[in-house]
Interface confidence: low
């Protein structure tokens, strides 16, 4: 294996519109040029990149639906973080939907935890 | 929950060919660098093969340099190894591992269970 | 030669504090490289530990407890695994890697096999 074998830690560019891709590939924020010669920037608020690529595009932002709060706007390195708005929450198994929180608990438990954006209310038996 | 399920694995005289497949599910597959490793019965890990998200760029162990290719099909989240001219000292359970980086490796993040191939007259 | 060389076995005892060394061959400089750690239990496949380049660019791998930390020591053109606390379930094989330019390879040390004595 030659010294050239290995790779040498890539450090993030600081931002800006043009630069030049190290080893192919450009930073966070940015994407390659179909020439491969430099990086471009992504648009902020249209589109992003998380890690060191060589896309020719920059991943399109994600849209919060209806029934959805945006709780982090999208960056050129950060897609959109979005929430179930209160009084509804997302399951681990259909995570494309806000279900409603359940009202209130079944005669005989009580509730020991309130609706939150991630679970529904959890109910206990009485005695437990 | 990010998992890679390999399958393909199996006894093969040598000079014959077998083709390893690896079924992804719980992330974008289609943005990550891919990987094949192997580990020789008792021994150490050896990177065998590598793709970059899109397919575009494809890296092999001088070992198997000419004899195998790897390959992806990110309309059905899945990375394949296609080996020939297999020898003995192929003999190995083979993993897939996913890199955290689209295209350089960066860390295999996430790692199958493995699939043995066994090299053998 | 290898590129990586790593110990062959290590033991310590249960809730102490161990150190595992990676050293790169002294034609290639650490200074530039990230270190990357993977455990291996018997009958399991590897798993991503951490990525150590240093203390301000670092990652630790998925569900990966603090306990597990790395370091390096440029001078001596090592790369180090610290485990506290030392648990049962931390006996195990332990590899060092480093990367190869734009994803070309995966170069893993030989791996150290770590005992835990009770």
């Known amino acids: 294996i030659t010294r050239q074998s290995l790779d040498p830690q890539r450090r993030a560019a600081p931002q800006q519109k043009r630069s030049s891709p190290i080893e192919g590939l450009c930073p966070p924020g940015h994407h390659i040029s179909e020439d491969s010669r430099e990086c471009i920037s992504c648009k902020y608020g249209q589109d992003y990149s998380t890690h060191w690529n060589d896309f020719l595009f920059c991943l399109r932002c994600t849209k919060c639906d209806s029934g959805e709060v945006e709780v982090n706007s999208c960056t050129t390195t950060r897609n959109t973080v979005c929430q179930c708005e209160e009084g509804t929450f997302r399951e681990e198994d259909s995570p494309e939907i806000c279900r409603k929180c359940r009202t209130g608990c079944p005669r005989g438990m009580v509730k020991v935890k309130d609706c939150t954006p991630w679970s529904d209310i959890e109910c206990v038996h009485k005695e437990s | 929950e990010v998992q890679l399920v390999e399958s393909g694995g199996g006894l093969v005289k040598p000079g014959g060919s077998l083709r390893l497949s690896c079924a992804a599910s719980?992330?974008?597959?289609?943005?990550?660098?891919m990987h094949w490793v192997r580990q020789a019965p008792g021994k150490g890990l050896e990177w065998v093969a590598g793709i970059n998200y899109s397919g575009n760029n494809k890296y092999y162990a001088d070992s198997v340099k000419g004899r195998f290719t790897i390959s992806r099909d990110n309309a059905k989240n899945s990375l394949y190894l296609q080996m020939n001219s297999l020898r003995a000292e192929d003999t190995a359970v083979y993993y897939c591992?996913?890199?955290?980086?689209?295209?350089?490796?960066?860390?295999?993040?996430?790692w199958g269970q493995g699939t043995l191939v066994t090299v053998s007259s | 030669q290898p590129v990586l060389h790593q110990p062959p076995a290590m033991s310590s005892a249960l809730g102490t504090t161990i150190r595992l060394t990676c050293t790169l061959r002294?034609?290639?400089?650490?200074?530039?490289?990230?270190v990357y750690w993977y455990q291996q239990r018997p009958g399991h496949p590897p798993r991503f530990l951490l990525r150590?380049?240093?203390?301000?660019?670092?990652?630790?791998g998925p569900q990966v407890p603090p306990r597990f930390s790395g370091s390096k020591d440029v001078a001596r053109n090592r790369g180090y695994l610290s485990i506290s606390e030392l648990q049962p379930e931390d006996e195990a094989m332990y590899y060092c890697a480093m990367g190869a330019r734009s994803s070309v390879t995966h170069v893993f040390g030989s791996g150290t096999q770590l005992t835990v004595l009770s």
């Open positions: 719980g992330f974008t597959f289609s943005t990550y660098g």
């Open positions: 002294n034609d290639h400089d650490i200074g530039v490289y990230s």
């Open positions: 150590y380049f240093s203390q301000s660019d670092k990652s630790q």
């Open positions: 591992a996913r890199d955290s980086s689209t295209t350089r490796t960066r860390a295999l993040d996430y």
